[in-house]
């Protein structure tokens, strides 16, 4: 969490951002909130990016003002116009690119004063893994697949019954480059699976951590997956 304060002649206002991560090829949110004003026409929102000459986005007098927007963000940004009045200056970024990573500044002017806060935005690829019994195998085997990751993640297997066990000798992980030549498909196979056990396939890079769990009994399986973004720090 980053909280910034204005230092102009007018009163300073509190602006708060949250470090976040964008999934390349998808839409992302750069989060920013501020002390609201009662008049929309008195609010100015400017998003800037370190190392970029033009603006990322500007919103003033109740509408977008994009005449000074940098080319790299053309047609890809939007604020939540109906939420600005309640202090939401978050920016929606369409079709996130690897090059969108960096330090952003959310700069706010209202009738109460000015304020700004920085935000670290990471970009990469992350996806939910699916674990299944691998029915192509001769012995009981689990296969964990996740379609899109970048940078290359680590994959670790764990089990509820054999807590702390190292499965690296009985697993095999491969990374296959996807067609856009950036993200990769992750496939990990675990051998010598025992029944009445729950196994977890954990995939992690510096942006996200995802886990696919599968409960294996003699008569059925049950799976669930979850994903968490790392380093979501507020400023």
């Amino acid at each position: 969490l980053i909280i910034g304060f204005g230092i102009s002649g007018r009163h300073s206002i509190t602006v708060t951002t949250v470090a976040s991560a964008g999934n390349i090829g998808e839409d992302g949110i750069l989060s920013c909130t501020f002390e609201p004003d009662i008049k929309l026409s008195d609010i100015v929102i400017q998003w800037l990016k370190e190392g970029v000459l033009g603006l990322v986005h500007e919103f003033k007098e109740g509408k977008d003002e994009l005449s000074e927007q940098d080319e790299m963000f053309r047609g890809r940004t939007a604020v939540f116009a109906d939420q600005v009045i309640v202090g939401n200056a978050s920016l929606r970024l369409k079709n996130v690119q690897l090059t969108d990573a960096g330090t952003y500044k959310c700069y706010i002017i209202t009738s109460k004063g000015k304020g700004n806060a920085n935000l670290e935005y990471k970009t990469g690829a992350f996806s939910m893994p699916e674990v299944n019994v691998d029915y192509n195998a001769s012995s009981e085997t689990l296969r964990c697949e996740a379609p899109r990751w970048f940078p290359q993640p680590t994959v670790v297997w764990a089990s509820q019954v054999d807590q702390g066990a190292n499965f690296s000798e009985v697993s095999n992980t491969s990374f296959e480059l996807n067609s856009e030549n950036v993200t990769m498909k992750v496939v990990s196979v675990l051998y010598n699976v025992t029944i009445n056990n729950t196994y977890s396939c954990m995939i992690e890079n510096d942006i996200a951590k995802a886990t696919g769990d599968i409960k294996v009994t003699e008569s059925e399986i049950k799976r669930r997956s979850h994903l968490q973004l790392l380093n979501s720090k507020a400023s």
């Epitope: 699916e130 299944n132 029915y135 192509n136 008569s219 059925e220 399986i221 049950k222 669930r224």
Partner: antibody, heavy 116, light 106 residues
């Protein structure tokens, strides 16, 4: 007495969506997964997916992923199946069933007819 | 996906006959489950975990098998047994059913 009561028959045009409900009673709704299965006229059974009512976690048959959406409303003990972009091949009886244990429970089925 | 092939697809038998339905999976699935369905009705769980009879299922029914090959047997067919029987696996996603075996009166 455990019961799963489904909504009534539907007739839809190709490209439309349908939402079928399944109201559970007689047991703790959040303790058992709900499965959805369909059966085309004169055909066999086809598994669509499952949902855990305790946290709405879902697993889908890849064939239906993106077209089928499973949801629950815990306040009314009701599970829902929504199927979008309907085509004539989706004409079938849709069943909800409770997680299979020594006794299984099924809804009475909902006939969805897709016709122009 | 694991494919399940039942045989025969249909059979005609008389009351008192011994009837055997087989189900073959494209991969080892450890356990099989069986359903009975009558026309216009929802399926009913009939045999679970290969050989355990569901609540209320008569003892003339039995199930056996392992790996990829499983069998449902009716030792002495009764009038109420005329129905369609489906095998089912929940050992690999997506869960799948056999195409069904229709048991008809001769």
């Amino acid at each position: 007495e455990v019961q799963l009561v489904q909504s009534g028959a539907e007739v839809k045009k190709p490209g439309a969506s349908v939402k079928v409900s399944c109201k559970a009673s007689g047991y703790t709704f959040t303790n058992f997964w709900i499965h959805w299965v369909r059966q085309a006229p004169g055909q066999g059974l086809e598994w669509i997916g499952e949902i855990d009512p305790s946290d709405s976690y879902t697993n889908y048959n890849q064939k239906f992923k993106g077209r089928a959406t499973l949801t629950v409303d815990k306040s009314s003990n009701t599970a829902y199946l929504e199927l979008s972009s309907l085509r004539s091949e989706d004409t079938a009886v849709y069943y909800c069933s409770r997680e299979i244990t020594t006794v299984d429970y099924w809804g009475q089925g909902t006939l969805v007819t897709v016709s122009s | 996906d694991i494919q399940m092939t039942q045989s025969p697809s249909s059979l005609s038998a008389s009351v008192g006959d011994r009837v055997t339905i087989t189900c073959s999976a494209t991969s080892s699935i450890s356990y099989m489950h069986w359903y009975q369905q009558k026309p216009g009705k929802a399926p009913k769980g009939w045999i679970y975990d290969t050989s355990k009879l569901a609540h209320g299922v008569p003892s003339r029914f039995s199930g056996s098998g392992s790996g990829t090959d499983f069998t449902l047997t009716i030792s002495s067919l009764q009038p109420e047994d005329f129905a369609t029987y489906y095998c089912h696996q929940r050992r690999s996603y997506p869960f799948t059913f056999g195409q069904g075996t229709k048991v008809e009166i001769k």
